[in-house]
């Protein structure tokens, strides 16, 4: 009873339940491979509880181990398009601070038009995650085809 | 000590740990694209703790943000089969209540024989999730090749 | 307040937050399809909190339902390589104790060079998970391309 009350009284953030699910906003100019994300209930089913967006990139607010997941679908794509455009590659990494810059997750499209994956990784408050799509094919903005999210798992 | 005792005394359901992992039961008639799922320890490694099955579709019992994941493998498939039968598409969505109907997750097979993905999404008590496989290829019923599950993550 | 204090005082392990993320160490001799994993902060972003490695295979220390995830990328690979070497298949399963041996997750590469998936499954203390890569193509050891992990979800 006491635990249940305490659980209700404490703000969720103090339990460390940081979580975010983002939808694609736009790409940058052709020499900038980053995808720019957006989130919030007004946009549909995307949300940020803890992490924040900084110029379309996801910034972490709480140290811990996170499950990072992503799916990206190419907007104009058939298996022949995808193979003609090889290599089209998606990489998720820490892009700032520069001292912590590292690639966390990397996939190539080869003959497919969608990549999807997930991994556990330690992240620290202030880490900004960037998702780089190399190649010239545009990603789909459909919210069920392209999305990116993180979930705090443990300290 | 007190917290540990309280945690043991409280039923798990009150902590919001709803979770389900389902295996494929069967497909419907050709004009019904839905996959029909089954779960329970008697069937192997599938289970439902909180959510329920309603005529083979998964119904949510607790409001919250969920991690939804799926893998579907086509039963008789090679890369040539998959491309010849293109488009074969898998979509996971809320199919009832009708007022909340929306596609959450969509993937095409293109030249592959398996799709797998996951995403975070808010779900409400009473939401029923449907998994629609469009195209003429049948999915594999092997429990290590085709499965569908949800995990409650936070309120 | 009392809950917050209790949460800080209790070791994380007693809350059941077992989690591991591993990177590829090496493959075995050609007649041994298992991948051999390694983990620890000295190696980069891999870690073991609860589970242990036993000769490169992951051993579970706590009963519960786990999210198991994996990504494997083939080292020297194009869509033509992948299709020419078909079937290259990745299977994750319980390999010991022998009485609990079962395949949990299986994917073929077909014309792709990366597979990635995840599933929920019950695991018991002492279960050892093996990841079998059949075929002659070698996996990439890049830590952002090939990884394997588990996360305790609930009892």
């Amino acid at each position: 009873q006491r635990f249940a009350q305490a659980q209700q009284q404490l703000p969720l953030e103090s339990l460390g339940w940081d979580v975010a699910e983002l939808q694609l906003n736009h790409t940058g100019p052709q020499q900038d491979p980053r995808l720019y994300w957006q989130g919030g209930p007004a946009l549909g089913r995307s949300f940020l509880h803890g992490p924040e967006l900084d110029k379309g990139q996801l910034r972490i607010h709480r140290d811990g181990i996170y499950m990072v997941h992503i799916q990206v679908t190419l907007a104009i794509c058939s298996s022949t398009t995808a193979s003609r455009h090889h290599p089209t590659t998606l990489a998720v990494g820490i892009c700032s601070p520069a001292s912590r810059s590292i690639s966390l997750l990397r996939l190539s499209f080869h003959q497919g038009c969608t990549i999807a994956s997930q991994r556990l990784t330690p992240l620290a408050r202030g880490d900004t995650l960037c998702t780089n799509l190399t190649g010239t094919l545009l990603p789909s903005r459909n919210t069920d085809e392209t999305f990116f999210g993180v979930q705090w798992v443990r300290p | 000590q007190r917290f540990a005792q309280a945690q043991q005394q409280l039923p798990l359901e009150s902590l919001g740990w709803d979770v389900a992992e389902l295996q494929l039961n069967h497909t419907g008639p050709q004009q019904d694209p839905r996959l029909y799922w089954q779960g329970g320890p008697a069937l192997g490694r599938s289970f439902l703790h909180g959510p329920e099955l309603d005529k083979g579709q998964l119904r949510i019992h607790r409001d919250g943000i969920y991690m939804v994941h799926i893998q579907v493998t086509l039963a008789i498939c090679s890369s040539t089969t998959a491309s010849r039968h293109h488009p074969t598409t898998l979509a996971v969505g809320i199919c009832s209540p009708a007022s909340r109907s929306i596609s959450l997750l969509r993937l095409s097979f293109h030249q592959g024989c398996t799709i797998a993905s996951q995403r975070l999404t808010p779900l409400a008590r009473g939401d029923t999730l449907c998994t629609n496989l469009t195209g003429t290829l049948l999915p594999s019923r092997n429990t290590d090749e085709t499965f569908f599950g949800v995990q409650w993550v936070r309120p | 307040q009392r809950f917050a204090q209790a949460q800080q005082q209790l070791p994380l392990e007693s809350l059941g937050w077992d989690v591991a993320e591993l990177q590829l160490n090496h493959t075995g001799p050609q007649q041994d399809p298992r991948l051999y994993w390694q983990g620890g902060p000295a190696l980069g972003r891999s870690f073991l909190h609860g589970p242990e490695l036993d000769k490169g295979q992951l051993r579970i220390h706590r009963d519960g339902i786990y999210m198991v995830h994996i990504q494997v990328t083939l080292a020297i690979c194009s869509s033509t390589t992948a299709s020419r070497h078909h079937p290259t298949t990745l299977a994750v399963g319980i390999c010991s104790p022998a009485s609990r041996s079962i395949s949990l997750l299986r994917l073929s590469f077909h014309q792709g060079c990366t597979i990635a998936s995840q599933r929920l499954t019950p695991l018991a203390r002492g279960d050892t998970l093996c990841t079998n890569l059949t075929g002659t193509l070698l996996p990439s050891r890049n830590t952002d391309e090939t990884f394997f992990g588990v996360q305790w979800v609930r009892p």
Partner: nanobody
Framework: EVQLVESGGGLVQAGGSLRLSCAAS????????MAWYRQPPGKQREAVAQ???????YYQDRVKGRFTISRDNAKNLVNLQMSSLKPEDTAVYYC??????WGQGTQVTVSS
Amino acid sequence: EVQLVESGGGLVQAGGSLRLSCAASESIFNNYVMAWYRQPPGKQREAVAQISTDGSAYYQDRVKGRFTISRDNAKNLVNLQMSSLKPEDTAVYYCTAGLQYWGQGTQVTVSS
């Protein structure tokens, strides 16, 4: 200021042709992948064709062989030549630069 302006839409009979144009500011035209999207009545917006700064072009399967996207570097224009039009091509057509900048759209109606 307006970044992208479409023109060329209209009513055409099935089997006919139309040419859509999208005028872009120089800084956008020179730096972004340009694409045409369309939104049929009551449906989601979908990609039709795209062209990179180097001129490489890609098409949605349903328009391949019927539509041609091109860049006019002298005028900062992206054109979409549409032929063998079908009733299912009826939609509002939008020009976009990297999904970041969008035109206001131009209506294309194909009657049977």
